[in-house]
């Protein structure tokens, strides 16, 4: 089963001190969304027990394997179902905690009920505050049963569930009619998928006989041990205040596990820690009782004393759960409850025994799950024990399961079952991922999904040039870090593969699939310099540059021009895609802007050194366009233009520029300056008779402004061909040739 514990702190005087903590003892638990496993999730489950909305609860992660929920503001926030989800893939497991209000009308005598398929389950709700109304039982939030209030027996309402089946599992509640749901008694019923003492798909396999209140898991036959006990059969007590599958966790606070409820994966459910009982787990066990919820009785013999955390403490000369076994009977010593080996290895397993008469090599044997008996190849005899060593044939997956070491002498016999887990070395399912590349190095993420078993202890990255027959280069890295492959050849393809290992002898897995990673081109090394530039308009700039002369071909694909507008904090980049280019026209720039300009050579995705920067000031943009431009023919060679001044001028106009062009003509237009900016009219002379002309105009302040609308007009008559248009402004009565 997954090593996952949900702890509820039940010191309920102040809901703000209440917290729930989910602790995982799994390797690599909760690291997040990397390849080694999803994070721990801890949340309130409002699907069945809905409580009034309150402020959001606070989730705090403490390291990689612990998450805590706080922020309860009122007692009703606590009532309901909480769940913690941990473990990866097929081992993903949900642990559930059901919290009852201590002030509810009805209280459960026992919250968690774990029963076997076919059993009768009895849920008992104790009357705490009587109401003379019906009691409604619900299952997973839906109506289930009604009891008349007279049906209470000894102040309890009982719900009998005969012949329960796994679908009967869930959250049950008992509520007085017309009482708040928060006043309900909430229960959790867990129905194992098999009858008592059996597990497996067809319930054909026999459970190992879990001790100290451990519950046999109906899927894998493992014992889910109560908090405070460990071992394949939960035969070993942890030190006081410790819990977890290997007793590796410690209860917080000075009073140990007092006031804490422990919830473990199904089919265990929840209980107090070892040595504690009561609805709030604050009462110590009565004399003669021990274990989780104080459910176990010591019944110590031969002078043994009862310890409420571990059970019988035997005097010297005696051992056994009740101190019923004499030390003269042979005894297996210090046998690990669980061993782990890698597939196809040939491990050595040791089994030590003591007794009187003294066990010898032939009196100790090892039995595999399939019934095969192994005899020891050698024995080490010491004054207080004999240790037999067994050489195990090459392991296969079917060797996973319960092995047994047995010692037999004329004084009696003893046996100890232990679990052997045969693990499959991990094999990457995907190729490593390229993160970044340079000309002589590749940065690679070796974290990939894998088949087989974790945890991953080492990652080896094998690489060599593509199509090469040379030996593979190998680099060993930490599982959680990215790898930089260095001293590579530029513009070269490399075949890269990952090999994963798990702890233990023979833990190296097969190599994963290869992937091709190519180093970048060599970096361009030449530094250009700016030859010059000139402004071709308020928003146009022509730039030219040079490169130093070097022997050999030019390493580069083109140039990158960069314009930095410091005022606005904006950068403009212009790509010139020919390495032969030495000039470029930059358009669409912002008039009146001070730019810093540089140029650099690029090759593939790599940039060479930038030229020394130049500073360029573009002239500001001109004024808006003149308004209402109108053309009127005066004769066969004269057309008068009239207009209105532009609006919203940024300064005084220095001149107007008129553009004249023959309509439909192919020739260049002619520009005529009107140097008296106060004018709103001018006469264009020297035009051809009976010819259609196009006119537009713009104003100038520091720079030229926008063009006005274009107007058309034809000259009159059929006169002689003029030499070309000229212009006359109307300034009072004067007529000046401009």
């Amino acid at each position: 089963a997954v090593d996952l514990t949900l702890l509820a702190n039940l010191r309920l005087t102040d809901p703000q001190r209440f917290f729930l903590t989910c602790v995982s003892g799994e390797a690599g638990a909760g690291r997040g969304s990397d390849a080694w496993g999803p994070p721990l999730l801890l949340e309130k489950d409002d699907r069945i027990v809905r409580t009034p909305p309150g402020p959001p609860l606070r989730l705090a992660r403490n390291g990689s394997h612990q998450v805590t929920l706080r922020g309860f503001s009122k007692p009703s926030d606590l009532v309901g179902v909480f769940s913690c989800v941990g473990g990866a893939g097929a081992r993903r497991t949900r642990v559930i905690y059901v919290h009852n209000s201590p002030g509810a009308h009805l209280l459960p005598d026992k919250v968690t009920h774990t029963v076997n398929k076919g059993d009768t389950a009895v849920l008992s709700a104790r009357v705490h505050k009587e109401k003379q109304t019906d009691v409604i039982w619900k299952s997973n939030g839906s109506y289930f049963y009604t009891l008349d209030w007279h049906e209470a027996q000894d102040g309890r309402f009982l719900l009998q569930l005969p012949n329960v089946q796994p679908p009967s599992s869930g959250i049950y509640s008992a509520t007085y009619l017309e009482a708040s749901p928060l006043g309900s008694a909430f229960f959790r019923l867990i129905v194992r998928g098999c009858g008592a003492g059996r597990w497996g798909p067809g319930c054909t396999k026999e459970c190992p006989g879990c001790l100290h209140g451990g519950v046999c898991h109906d899927h894998d036959g493992e014992c889910v041990c109560p908090p405070g006990f460990t071992g394949t059969r939960c035969e070993q007590a942890c030190r006081e205040g410790r819990f977890g599958q290997s007793c590796q966790e410690q209860c917080p606070g000075i009073s140990g596990c007092r006031g804490l409820t422990f919830c473990l994966p199904d089919p265990y459910g929840c209980s107090c820690g070892s040595g504690w009982r009561g609805s709030q787990c604050q009462e110590a066990c009565a004399p003669g009782h021990f274990g989780a919820d104080c459910r176990l009785q010591c019944q110590c013999q031969n002078g043994g004393t009862c310890d409420r955390f571990s059970g019988c403490v035997c005097p010297s000369g005696w051992h056994g759960v009740h101190c019923e076994k004499s030390d003269r009977i042979p005894q297996i010593l210090n046998m690990a409850s669980e061993l782990e080996f890698n597939l196809e290895t040939m491990p050595r397993i040791n089994c030590a025994a003591a007794g009187n008469p003294f066990p010898v090599r032939g009196s100790i044997e090892l039995r595999k799950p399939d019934g095969t008996v192994l005899l020891s190849t050698k024995a080490i005899v010491e004054p207080e024990k004999t240790t037999a060593e067994f050489e195990v044939p090459r392991l296969v997956l079917a060797d996973s399961g319960f092995w047994e070491c047995r010692v037999s002498t004329s004084g009696g016999q003893d046996s100890r079952r232990f679990k052997v887990n045969v693990k499959v070395p991990p094999v990457p399912l995907a190729a490593p991922r390229l993160l970044t590349k340079q000309s002589r190095q590749l940065v690679v993420s070796p974290l990939v999904s894998f088949s087989g078993d974790g945890p991953i202890s080492t990652v080896r990255l094998h690489y060599r040039p593509q199509d090469s027959t040379m030996d593979w280069s190998t680099i060993v890295v930490d599982p959680s870090e990215n790898v930089t492959l260095m001293n590579l050849r530029p513009k070269t393809g490399y075949s890269v593969r990952v090999q994963l290992s798990r702890p233990g002898e023979g833990g190296e897995g097969a190599w994963g699939p290869p992937t091709l990673m190519t180093t970048d081109c060599p970096e361009p090394l030449l530094q250009p310099w700016l030859e010059g530039w000139h402004v071709e308009g308020t928003d146009r700039l022509r730039v030219s540059w040079s490169l130093p002369l070097v022997p050999g071909p030019l390493v580069g694909d083109g140039f990158l021009l960069r314009l930095w507008d410091g005022t606005r904090g904006q950068e403009r980049r212009e790509n010139v895609s020919s390495p032969q280019a030495r000039t470029a026209l930059l358009t669409g720039l912002t008039p009146g802007t001070h730019y810093q300009l540089d140029v650099q050579l690029y090759h593939c995705t790599l940039l060479g050194p930038a030229s020394p920067p130049a500073h360029v000031l573009l002239p500001p943009s001109g004024p808006p366009a003149p308004r209402h431009l109108h053309a009127q023919a005066l004769s066969d060679s004269e057309i008068q233009l009239t207009w209105k001044h532009p609006e919203a001028l940024p300064g005084p106009i220095s001149k107007y520029v008129v553009e004249v062009q023959v309509a439909g003509g192919a020739g260049d237009p002619l520009w005529i300056d009107v140097d008296r900016p106060e004018e709103t009219s001018t006469i264009i002379r020297g035009l051809n008779a009976s010819t259609r002309y196009l006119f537009r105009m713009r104003a100038s302040i520091q720079g030229l402004g926008d063009w006005s609308n274009t107007v058309e007009e034809s000259t009159l008559g059929n006169g002689l061909q003029a030499e070309g248009p000229v212009q006359e402004s109307r300034a009072a009565e004067e007529g000046l040739d401009q």
Epitope: Y145, T146, D148, E151
Partner: antibody, heavy 117, light 110 residues
Framework: EVQLLESGGGLVQPGGSLRLSCAAS????????MGWVRQAPGKGLEWVSR????????YYADSVKGRFTISRDNSKNTLYLQMNSLRAEDTAVYYC??????????WGQGTLVTVSS | QYELTQPASVSGSPGQSITISCTGT?????????VSWYQQHPGKAPKLTIF???KRPSGVSDRFSGSKSDNTASLTISGLQAEDEADYYC??????????FGTGTKVTVL
Amino acid sequence: EVQLLESGGGLVQPGGSLRLSCAASGFTFSRYVMGWVRQAPGKGLEWVSRIYPSGGFTYYADSVKGRFTISRDNSKNTLYLQMNSLRAEDTAVYYCTRIREGYFDYWGQGTLVTVSS
Amino acid sequence: QYELTQPASVSGSPGQSITISCTGTSSDVGGYNYVSWYQQHPGKAPKLTIFDVTKRPSGVSDRFSGSKSDNTASLTISGLQAEDEADYYCGSYTSSGSRVFGTGTKVTVL
């Protein structure tokens, strides 16, 4: 689909007896409170009796107390109403009902009981 | 056996909204959130229309809505339709654990 089917109604003389039955289907009969409601011709609804799932607790309207007995057979999914010492004012359509928290969620089609000489 | 008080009849035109009241005491309507309403067409069995004051069973049109204020519960039928013409009874849980019905209201669609 929940179905309640009453039977056993008919004409009976004052002082006589009659036993109504209600066959239930489409739900787990043994988990529900069941009851009888009657409606005299042209009149409103009147609650008559109810019985809890275990069958051990029964309640009656004052107008029928001591004369009517409600019972159930959970193995047969059947509800009964034994009516003794019938009076003219017991003439009504009798409906079998399933009772949820505070309401009657399913009703049978009814069976007519006529008490007349 | 006491009853809850309802108007004998209520009528309305198609598309209109009508409201039926049901008055009891603090021992029934006012004391519990277990008011229910039943629709009964002539010659048919009653059918649950509203329960727990405001809740609608699946299959009942959302034109039917329930409410409660003090000792009086109300059933509102909006967008009245011809098929809504029927007798309507309110019901309540009582402090004695019993159930009591209203006197009934005949709804006529004009």
